[in-house]
Amino acid sequence: LTCLGGFASPGPVPPSTALRELIEELVNITQNQKAPLCNGSMVWSINLTAGMYCAALESLINVSGCSAIEKTQRMLSGFCPHKVSAGQFSSLHVRDTKIEVAQFVKDLLLHLKKLFREGQFN
């Protein structure tokens, strides 16, 4: 079960539903972006491979005071089996490359859409 209860969903949902809703939230962010997202904050780039949900959360959790990505942070926590806190990093981070949050979101969205189309929901 993908359990996002208490975060963004009304309770446990299928993995495909959780991924669908995460994609829609990222679409929302990209569509509604007017000023630079999160004031142009920079985050560590990640390898979009297995374990990327935790890696993405580890990157984004270091952005504070940005309400636009708070829901995304909560949703990503539902995909990550362990607790993630600011300053925590995994081997999936490309530690020599920082990108703007807006670009990070776009890259993540493109990859998640590809996974969704290919039926890779877990």
């Epitope: 079960l1 969903s9 009304p10 949902v13 299928p14 993995p15 495909s16 539903t17 669908r20 809703e21 994609i23 829609e24 679409v27 929302n28 569509q31 969704f116 039926g119 929901f121």
Partner: antibody, heavy 118, light 107 residues
């Protein structure tokens, strides 16, 4: 109460494009997911795809190369286009709602019959 | 795609009978299964979701059970309005898929 009403030509010639519209009343297509499902005569249900409240789309890979789902938010309508149709596309076509965070279809239109024949 | 197989494809029963329809998924779908009722010339209607949760307004004679790959829809006491075709649907992964249907006819 949300209601769905499908409309479109009942007869389409082979190799042409099937075009259907679903009008949503009592709710907004800028929320939830709006789906197309079809049912060939005397057969089961086949999922075609959806358009989301953001305008994002998903198509069943078995039909992907021929399907386009779009929307007109000003008219609160979604549409289905299926190109290069054959007799195998003869079916009753339904639009159905799927609410956010769900995976089941809670509201359906009454369906519209499309026959592919020359 | 996940294949959904229903059995039987049709059955004959009398008013008051207890009717059981089964649905088998080709892979584990946890409890992400719904059931629909369809009458001739009409759209399907949602009966049950999450394998056993009754949709609003659905009579309590309908019940669902199961998890993983095997599921059951039970009508405890068949009523005249229950003669219809029933479909299961998996929500585990896209594309969503339906069973072939079970037609419940009057004996």
């Amino acid at each position: 109460e949300v209601q769905l009403q499908e409309s479109g030509p009942g007869l389409v010639k082979p190799s042409e494009t099937l075009s259907l519209t679903c009008t949503v009343s009592g709710g907004s297509i800028s929320s939830d997911y709006w789906n197309w499902i079809r049912q060939p005569p005397g057969k089961g249900l086949e999922y075609i795809g959806y358009i989301s409240y953001n305008g994002n789309t998903y198509y069943n890979p078995s039909l992907k190369s021929r399907v386009t789902i779009s929307r007109d938010t000003s008219k609160n309508q979604l549409s289905l286009k299926l190109s290069s149709v054959t007799a195998a596309d003869t079916a009753v076509y339904y639009c159905a709602r799927l609410a956010k965070w769900t995976w089941y279809f809670d509201i359906w239109g009454q369906g519209t019959t499309v026959t592919v024949s020359s | 795609d996940i294949q959904m197989t229903q059995s039987p494809s049709s059955l004959s029963a009398s008013v008051g009978d207890r009717v059981t329809i089964t649905c088998h998924a080709s892979q584990n779908i946890n409890v992400w299964l719904s059931w629909y009722q369809q009458k001739p010339g009409k759209a399907p209607k949602l009966l049950i979701y999450k394998a056993s949760d009754l949709h609003t307004g659905v009579p309590s004679r309908f019940s669902g059970s199961g998890s993983g790959t095997d599921f059951t829809l039970t009508i405890s006491s068949l009523q005249p309005e229950d003669f219809a075709t029933y479909y299961c649907q998996q929500g585990q992964s896209y594309p969503y898929t339906f069973g072939g249907g079970t037609k419940v006819e009057i004996k």
